[in-house]
């Protein structure tokens, strides 16, 4: 007869049947609440290990917040109370560099990871005996699916990964060690669409479980890159989808950002939020930018969760939100993580390991300052973990949390064992803290990084820099010759030089016409299902960006495609990165380009740009002496005062913070 | 300078159609950008469709395939087709004619405005 669990283990090629034990008095009655560690004997391939699991303290809030929608569309904000949760990190003793992800809710279930063999366990279905299943990673079925452009290299790489021992991630880590010591905090939040809570029955309570032990998996994988993964947030559509999910994993994508940036942010701060779907693209796992972590527009992803384990999904995700990180696929570059492939593999592979090519890549972003929305520790009220002083995170009640006793030592700011600030002390962090004091008003915290952005002082009161805003979207730049879109001035003449250097520029029309009209990956409007759309006329130059004057050939850590189309007496020059299907394509003309009188690129369209809604007048509301920010209000010039810019002052908004100290008005400059 | 009246207005359920109207009077119809604009209360008036003189039709994100913009230039005047309409879609929808390239909101003249009530 069939066993129990026999559809269990339909995609596991092999798989073993064992009783764990727990190592306590009692045998298996945990007390409930749950405890804050415990330790089991399990059994692996004819070994027995002791595993030591320590509940996960960093990974969820006092005031875990779950958004869902009631029949009429009403968003509905609840705060269910899971300060005692069942969810574990661990390692396996006598094990050097193992590490555990481990729900203990209802039995074990979970991801161990040992030296050189990851294992997944469930408990089996309709045991009355605390039976589970463990299995090798590697033996689960997948479907063959796609985060990338096929590249010739992935044979090679596998080929050798095979005959040669690799170094293990922590030595490979110990090697570049420049930027990783510093932990990061990514702030995550996660939506799952109607399709996959029709798919989970419908139950919010199930679908909010196995989120949280998502995060946890997410957590213990990202943790061997020092960066710690606190979910933030949780949306359920539970009665229907609120972006359009048809067409291609691009759309998809770009509604997703665009919904994020609109509703999302202003409701709970983050930073990166991923879509959780059911639909499938075609063998596309997700699809998710690049470097775009601590954006306002584009930190995002859509993730494919079908018919596969929420162990094998959690890889797919780890592989978005690194994308969001900065990392790029693995394929072609010489990496090695330990393992026969690693999360940054185009191929959807399973692995747990990240490798030295996504360190890199990573510390390549914090280097050039795109992931400074990671250094922050989260607020008390915006992080989802059980308080507990000493684990780096300001929970509530705390005013500071500088880590472990021997950390604490070098913190002069904060008492370690209560994590309360000391006696002397106005702050212990934050841009706007410096030697325990906060910064005095008019202090710069935030500069002006473009003709588009506007600054941001401290405002002498809080350790935090103001948020930040930069010029209405819409607005007129370049003299006259483009928009502001998101703080930067989007011309083809700035795109060309980041790409081709500073004596590129756009090529002709004709160039973008000719190109784009192919419908190849060196000249098209975008994806649509698995092929390449050629560009109406119309619509050309918001396509493939074509570029001239080109003295410069691109390195950005990976080797672009280069190709050169001859044009009316010119040469175009266009640039394919080979990034695979599951990362928007930087060679493309940015979206918010001004690609017409008075129409902007959106969505690979040359449209109306009333749909940046811009809709001020600088001379009736800032009086002729400011501009708008993204929040609506003036940013007067200095010399004039805020709100209006009607009266004299020291420039600046309601939303920038004092751009001047009363004390010491040098500050100023 | 274009005079323009909104009509089509109304009360309808959700899921339900309405039809807006605008007709424009002035001479200058045919080289104006037309455009669909909503404010809903306590809300800031947002871009809802338009339609260029060289043909281009953009819509607002969360109109998208369900409401069509068309233009006959020989009557002046520009429709707004609204389908599957949801209780968000309530507002008063102003019809906004402009130059072509203008594109901020103060720009070109507005008619007075037409009530659409979706009830659930």
């Known amino acids: 007869a069939a066993r129990p669990g026999f559809q269990q283990t339909s995609h596991l090629s092999s798989y073993e049947i064992i009783t764990p034990w727990r190592l306590t008095r009692e045998r298996r009655e945990a007390p409930r609440p749950y405890s804050k560690q415990v330790s089991y004997v399990i059994q692996a391939e004819g070994k027995e290990h002791i595993i030591h699991l320590e509940r996960n303290k960093d990974l969820l809030p006092e005031d875990f917040v779950v958004y869902t929608y009631n029949k009429e569309g009403t968003l509905i904000t609840d705060h269910p109370n899971i300060q005692n949760h069942c969810h574990y990190r661990g390692y396996v003793e006598g094990v050097h560099n193992s590490s555990i992800a481990l729900s203990d809710c209802f039995g074990l279930r979970g991801l161990l990871h040992l030296e050189n063999a990851s294992y997944g366990i469930e408990p089996l279905q309709n045991s009355s005996h605390f039976e589970h299943i463990i299995y090798r990673m590697d033996d689960v079925y997948k479907e063959p699916l796609k985060c990338g452009v096929s590249n010739k290299d992935i044979e090679k790489e596998t080929a050798k990964d095979e005959e040669e021992e690799p170094p293990s991630m922590t030595q490979l880590l110990r090697r570049r060690r420049a930027v990783l010591p510093q932990t990061r905090y990514v702030e995550l939040f996660i939506v799952v669409d109607k399709e996959r809570y029709d798919m989970m029955g419908r139950n919010q309570t199930a679908v909010r479980e196995e989120m949280i032990l998502l995060a946890n998996y997410l957590d213990s994988m990202y943790i061997m890159l020092n960066i710690r993964i606190v979910l933030v947030g949780l949306e359920i559509w539970t009665n229907g989808n609120l972006i359009n999910i048809v067409g291609g994993a691009g759309d998809v994508l770009g509604n997703f950002v665009q919904w994020r940036e609109k509703f999302l942010i202003t409701r709970r701060r983050h930073d990166s939020a991923q879509l959780v779907l059911k639909k499938g693209f075609g063998g596309t796992a997700g699809m998710a930018f690049v470097g775009t972590v601590c954006s306002r527009s584009h930190a995002g992803g859509i993730n494919v969760f079908g018919q596969i384990t929420v162990e094998t999904f959690a890889s797919i995700v780890a592989h978005e939100l690194g994308h969001n990180l900065g990392m790029n696929h693995d394929d072609g570059r010489d990496c090695s993580c330990g393992a026969k492939s690693c999360i940054m593999n185009s191929g959807a592979s399973g692995s747990r390991n990240f490798s030295s090519c996504s360190a890199e890549d990573f510390e390549k972003l914090t280097l050039n300052k795109g992931g400074n929305c990671l250094l922050n520790i989260p607020k008390p009220d915006e992080a989802y973990s059980a308080p507990s002083c000493g684990n780096k995170l300001v929970d509530a009640g705390e005013e500071c949390d500088c880590g472990t006793p021997k950390e604490c030592e070098l913190d002069p700011c904060c008492e370690g064992s209560t994590c309360k600030l000391k006696s002397f002390a106005e702050c212990a962090y934050g841009d706007c803290c410096k030697d325990c004091r906060f910064l005095p008003g008019g202090t710069l915290c935030r500069g002006k990084t473009s003709e588009c952005d506007v600054p941001e002082y401290c405002n002498g009161s809080s350790q935090f820099c103001q948020p930040d805003v930069f010029i209405q979207n819409g607005y007129p730049c370049q003299n006259n010759k483009a928009y502001c879109y998101n703080g930067m001035c989007q011309y083809y003449d700035a795109q060309c030089q980041v790409i081709f250097g500073s004596k590129a520029k756009a090529a002709p029309k004709d160039c973008f016409i000719e190109v784009n009209s192919k419908g190849d990956r060196f000249g098209n409007c975008g994806f649509s299902g698995n092929e390449y759309k050629k560009c109406a006329t119309g619509n050309a130059l918001c396509g493939k960006l074509q570029c001239e004057n080109v003295q410069e050939i691109p390195v950005f850590g990976i080797v672009p495609a280069i190709i050169q189309t001859p044009s009316r007496g010119t040469k175009c020059w266009g640039v394919d990165f080979q990034l695979g299907s599951d990362v928007p394509d930087p060679g493309m003309v940015n979206e918010g380009t001004k690609c017409g009188a008075g129409k902007i690129c959106r969505n690979f369209q040359c449209v109306d740009a009333s749909v940046l809604n811009y809709d001020c007048d600088v001379q009736k509301k800032c009086h002729g002496h400011g501009v708008c920010n993204s929040n609506k209000n003036c940013h007067c010039e200095n010399g004039w005062a805020p709100p209006n810019c009607e009266t004299k002052g020291y420039g600046g908004s309601v939303d920038s913070g004092p751009t001047y100290n009363e004390m010491n008005t040098a500050l100023r400059d | 300078e274009v005079q323009l009246v909104e009509s089509g207005g109304g009360l309808v359920q959700a899921g339900g159609s309405l039809r807006l109207s605008c007709a424009a009077s002035?001479?200058?119809?045919?080289?104006?950008?037309m455009a669909w604009y909503r404010q809903a209360p306590r809300k800031q008036r947002e871009f809802v469709a338009s339609?260029?003189?060289?043909?281009?039709?953009t819509y607002a994100d969360s109109v998208k395939g369900r409401f069509a913009i068309s233009r006959d230039t020989a009557k002046n005047t520009v429709a707004l087709q609204m389908n599957s309409l949801k209780p968000e879609d309530t507002a008063v929808y102003y019809c906004?004619?402009?130059?072509?390239?203008?594109?901020?909101?103060?720009?070109?003249?507005w008619g007075q405005g037409t009530q659409v009530t979706v009830s659930s």
């Open positions: 002035g001479s200058i119809f045919s080289s104006n950008t």
């Open positions: 906004n004619a402009r130059q072509y390239g203008e594109y901020w909101q103060a720009a070109g003249s």
């Open positions: 339609i260029m003189t060289d043909g281009t039709i």
